[in-house]
């Protein structure tokens, strides 16, 4: 899977995680920090 960093405008999109762009799937994706979940890593689940 080809990945790259998200566009600059997505800075801040992922609240507790890193935004990556999945080129083959044409999707931005939030890789959440441990303890966080949700589309934008907005939920703390511990």
């Amino acid at each position: 899977v080809s990945i790259t960093k998200c566009n600059s405008d997505m800075n801040g999109y992922c609240l507790h995680g890193q935004c990556i762009y999945l080129v083959d799937m044409s999707q931005n994706y939030c890789r959440c920090e441990v303890g966080y979940t949700g589309v934008r890593c907005e939920h703390f689940y511990l």
Epitope: N7, Q27, R40
Partner: antibody, heavy 116, light 106 residues
Framework: QDQLVQSGAEVKKPGASVKVSCKAS????????IQWVRQAPGQGLEWMGR????????KYREKFEGRVTITADTSTNTAYMELSSLRSEDTAVYYC?????????WGQGTLVTVSS | DIQMTQSPSSLSASVGDRVTITCKAS??????IAWYQQKPGQAPRLLIQ???TLQPGVPSRFSGSGSGTDYTFTISSLQPEDIATYYC????????FGGGTKVEIK
């Protein structure tokens, strides 16, 4: 099925304000950014600004700063664009556009006519 | 703000011709460019995103390339149904549309 349904056409007098709504269904606007784009008759596409409904922060194109206000009501899954001090050059079709995890998905557009 | 200079503003070509439209950004946009097709009375239709990724259902005669500040959109063999206005959009840093290219049949 994801949808963005915008409010109906408006006719306004110069100097007045207009507020266009954009109701999302099939997805949560908190997972997205909502952009606003307009197109005057026979003219090109012009980006106006956007809102992050989760953080409630906005970014506007410089030329609209102070005249446009973009808001979102996450309880009704609806975004709004209000443009004040209308002039004839603001006659255009106004589109809301979803961006974020997936690339852009457009509403059907709302025609705003400014005429005395 | 990033500026997008799109050229030409209009062109006339014959059915079967190769058509090329260019967009130049005022700074590096890291391949974050999309191309839209718009027909009169319709909302814009997304053809390509991230420089060269074709949307589902878009014919393979449409393609995109480029990097840095210089980007190209190509119709390899112009068809009558391709008559429309085409716009580039940079979405690296906020958003800016190019001025559009009106494509007509000769």
């Amino acid at each position: 099925q994801d949808q963005l349904v915008q409010s109906g056409a408006e006719v306004k007098k110069p100097g007045a304000s207009v507020k266009v709504s954009c109701k999302a269904s099939g997805f949560n606007i908190k997972d997205t950014y909502i952009q606003w784009v307009r197109q005057a008759p026979g003219q090109g596409l012009e980006w106006m600004g956007r809102i992050d409904p989760l953080r409630r922060n906005t970014k506007y194109r410089e030329k609209f700063e102070g005249r446009v206000t973009i808001t979102a009501d996450t309880s009704t899954n609806t975004a709004y664009m209000e443009l004040s001090s209308l002039r004839s050059e603001d006659t255009a079709v106004y589109y809301c556009v979803r961006s974020g995890r997936l690339f852009d998905f457009w509403g059907q557009g709302t025609l705003v006519t400014v005429s005395s | 703000d990033i500026q997008m200079t799109q050229s030409p503003s209009s062109l006339s070509a014959s059915v079967g011709d190769r058509v090329t439209i260019t967009c130049k950004a005022s700074q590096d946009i890291h391949k974050y460019i999309a191309w839209y097709q718009q027909k009169p009375g319709q909302a814009p239709r997304l053809l390509i995103q991230y420089t060269s990724t074709l949307q589902p259902g878009v014919p393979s005669r449409f393609s995109g390339s480029g990097s840095g500040t210089d980007y190209t959109f190509t119709i390899s063999s112009l068809q009558p149904e391709d008559i429309a206005t085409y716009y580039c959009l940079q979405y690296d840093n906020l958003r800016t549309f190019g001025g559009g290219t009106k494509v007509e049949i000769k």
